[in-house]
């Protein structure tokens, strides 16, 4: 080296990573390294992992004069010593209504009836322990099973002879088999009763009210009944008031008033009669008018009183 550019070992410092340079001779130096580094120029990071203390399955990751731990999912903290509360972290850790219990390094599920597995996601196969009669098909359900019976068999386990095979239910009744004893149960159609649905229901003798309205007469029939209605009523239960005005019985522009079982015609001046069909003689018109008006008023009073209305005379 020329005298113009003399070599100074520590200028610039060859020590890296914060190492301090000390000149030991004209052309020599020594680096004093910071903790965690080694080598003639402190170039090497000392591997701290051989002496690591990562717990619970944590993996050591070297740092500068220290180390860090990469934790498995169930653990946290610098050294993986802190338990992760999976029940808090994953609200659905346990499925199908299972109860979650946090544990060191994991969690546990207490499953409700019918479910199993670590997270209660497996439906227990109840058919594995079922005793469906041979020939029937077992269907697994949650915490239970059901047996699908072949023709002629019935009951919870298909162990009973199906009493419906002999068609014991009459009148188109629906037949079911009691799953406990194998007896038939008939669901009778309207109008019939009894174990086999052979007995007629007397609708007219029922203790509650007459099924026929407006004082209609009830007549029992096989499996049903019918109503004989009073004059002025119609319908299966005499529920309809017949509108006698419907056929326009009033003549000469008269107004028709419908009544129970009949009608009244309000005649135009100069006419009279049930249907206002009679033309009045003009000579007696004044007297006839008064007579007709009174007759009409009498009819109106009857009509309104029959319907519980009050009629005021003005």
């Amino acid at each position: 080296a020329g005298s113009d550019n003399p070599y100074v070992p520590c200028a610039p410092s060859p020590c890296v990573n914060g190492g301090t340079c000390r000149q030991t001779g004209d052309f020599t130096f020594e680096c004093s390294c910071l903790p965690g580094f080694e080598g003639s120029t402190c170039e090497r990071n000392i591997d701290d992992c051989p002496n690591h203390r990562c717990q619970n399955g944590g993996v050591c990751v070297d740092g500068v004069n220290t180390y860090n731990c990469r934790c498995p999912p169930q653990w946290t903290g610098q050294f993986c010593t802190e338990d992760v509360d999976e029940c808090l972290l994953q609200p659905n850790a346990c499925q199908n209504g299972g109860t979650c219990t946090n544990r060191n390094g994991g969690y546990g599920c207490v499953c409700v009836n019918g479910w199993s597995g670590d997270d209660c996601s497996e439906n227990i196969d109840d058919c594995a322990f079922a005793s469906c009669t041979p020939g029937s098909t077992c269907i697994d359900r949650v915490a239970s099973f059901s047996c699908m019976c072949p023709e002629g068999k019935a009951g919870l386990l298909c162990h009973l002879d199906d009493a419906c095979i002999s068609n014991p239910c009459h009148k188109g009744a629906l037949c079911d088999t009691n799953p406990l004893n194998g007896h038939y149960i008939c669901t009778c159609p309207q109008g019939y009763k009894g174990a086999d649905c052979t007995e007629d229901v007397d609708e007219c003798a029922m203790t509650n009210s007459n099924p026929c309205e407006h004082a209609g007469k009830c007549v029992n029939t096989d499996g049903a009944f019918h109503c004989e209605c009073l004059k002025g009523y119609a319908g299966p239960r005499c529920e309809m008031d017949i509108n006698e005005c419907h056929s326009d019985p009033c003549q000469n522009d008269a107004t028709c008033l419908d009544k129970i079982g009949g009608f009244t015609c309000l005649c135009m001046p100069g006419f009279k009669g049930v249907h206002c069909e009679i033309e009045i003689n003009e000579g007696n018109s004044g007297l006839n008018d008064i007579f007709e008006a009174q007759k009409i008023e009498w009819h109106e009073n009857l009509y309104f009183q029959g319907h519980h209305h009050h009629h005021h005379h003005h």
Epitope: P35, D48, P50, N51, H52, R53, C54, Q55, N56, G57, G58, N65, T66, Y67, P72, Q78, F79, C80, T81, N104, G105
Partner: antibody
Framework: EVQLVESGGGLVQPGGSLKLSCAVS????????MEWVRQASGKGLEWVAA??????????VYSASVKDRFTISRDDSKSTLYLQMNSLKTEDTAVYYC???????????WGQGTLVTVSS | DIQMTQSPSSVSASVGDRVTITCQTS??????LAWYQQKPGKSPKLLIY???RLQDGVPSRFSGSGSGTDYTLTISSLQPEDFATYYC?????????FGGGTKVEIK
């Protein structure tokens, strides 16, 4: 209940060998770091060796004072930890404890200890 | 290796006294410190881990504190069964190292 029971201690001449055993129960052996710690009469506690758990490949660490002379090992099928001690010296005389590293950077379960006496 | 300096080496105290033991480490151990109690002829028993966490079944009169390089064990009200030797231990890295111990004696 966590239990650790040491055995195999006794009197041995300098240069001799001895194998200590530690039978464990009450926990999953392979899940834990296991340690050997010794205590000379009237003295403090001195860590000797450790074997990490299965998750850490059962890697092993020794104190400088026993390196190349002692060997730590385990038999998971028997749930037993061992310490093979060779080239024994008088200063190895101590009560040897087997302990479990409980995943807390601390030794949470200890055996009753077994006495090793190295003397001529 | 991490050096552990425990003090005092012994302390004389009476039942009901408050006792404090300190432990200093040669480098930051990130709260990876444990305290043990040992009675003559018996194995050590873990009292405190993680510098301040009480081990299951240990009476609440025992407490730990500290971080970095300075740690303390406190017995708030000394009981007759507490007369023993106490050790600190760093669990940050191997080799594990223990303090020299503190003997708590009856005054």
């Amino acid at each position: 209940e966590v239990q650790l029971v040491e055995s195999g201690g006794g009197l041995v001449q300098p240069g001799g060998s001895l194998k200590l055993s530690c039978a464990v129960s009450g926990f999953t052996f392979s899940d834990f770091y296991m340690e050997w710690v010794r205590q000379a009469s009237g003295k403090g506690l001195e860590w000797v060796a450790a074997q990490r758990n299965k998750a850490n490949d059962f890697s092993i660490v020794y104190s400088a004072s026993v390196k190349d002379r002692f060997t730590i090992s385990r038999d998971d099928s028997k749930s037993t930890l061992y310490l093979q001690m060779n080239s024994l010296k008088t200063e190895d005389t101590a009560v040897y404890y087997c302990s479990r590293d409980g995943g807390k950077l601390a030794l949470d379960a200890w055996g009753q200890g077994t006495l090793v006496t190295v003397s001529s | 290796d991490i050096q552990m300096t425990q003090s005092p080496s012994s302390v004389s105290a009476s039942v009901g006294d408050r006792v404090t033991i300190t432990c200093q480490t040669s480098e930051d151990i990130y709260s990876g410190l444990a305290w043990y109690q040992q009675k003559p002829g018996k194995s050590p028993k873990l009292l405190i881990y993680g510098a301040s966490r009480l081990q299951d079944g240990v009476p609440s009169r025992f407490s730990g504190s500290g971080s970095g390089t300075d740690y303390t064990l406190t017995i708030s009200s000394l009981q007759p069964e507490d007369f023993a030797t106490y050790y600190c231990q760093q669990g940050f890295k191997y080799p594990l190292t223990f303090g020299g111990g503190t003997k708590v004696e009856i005054k």
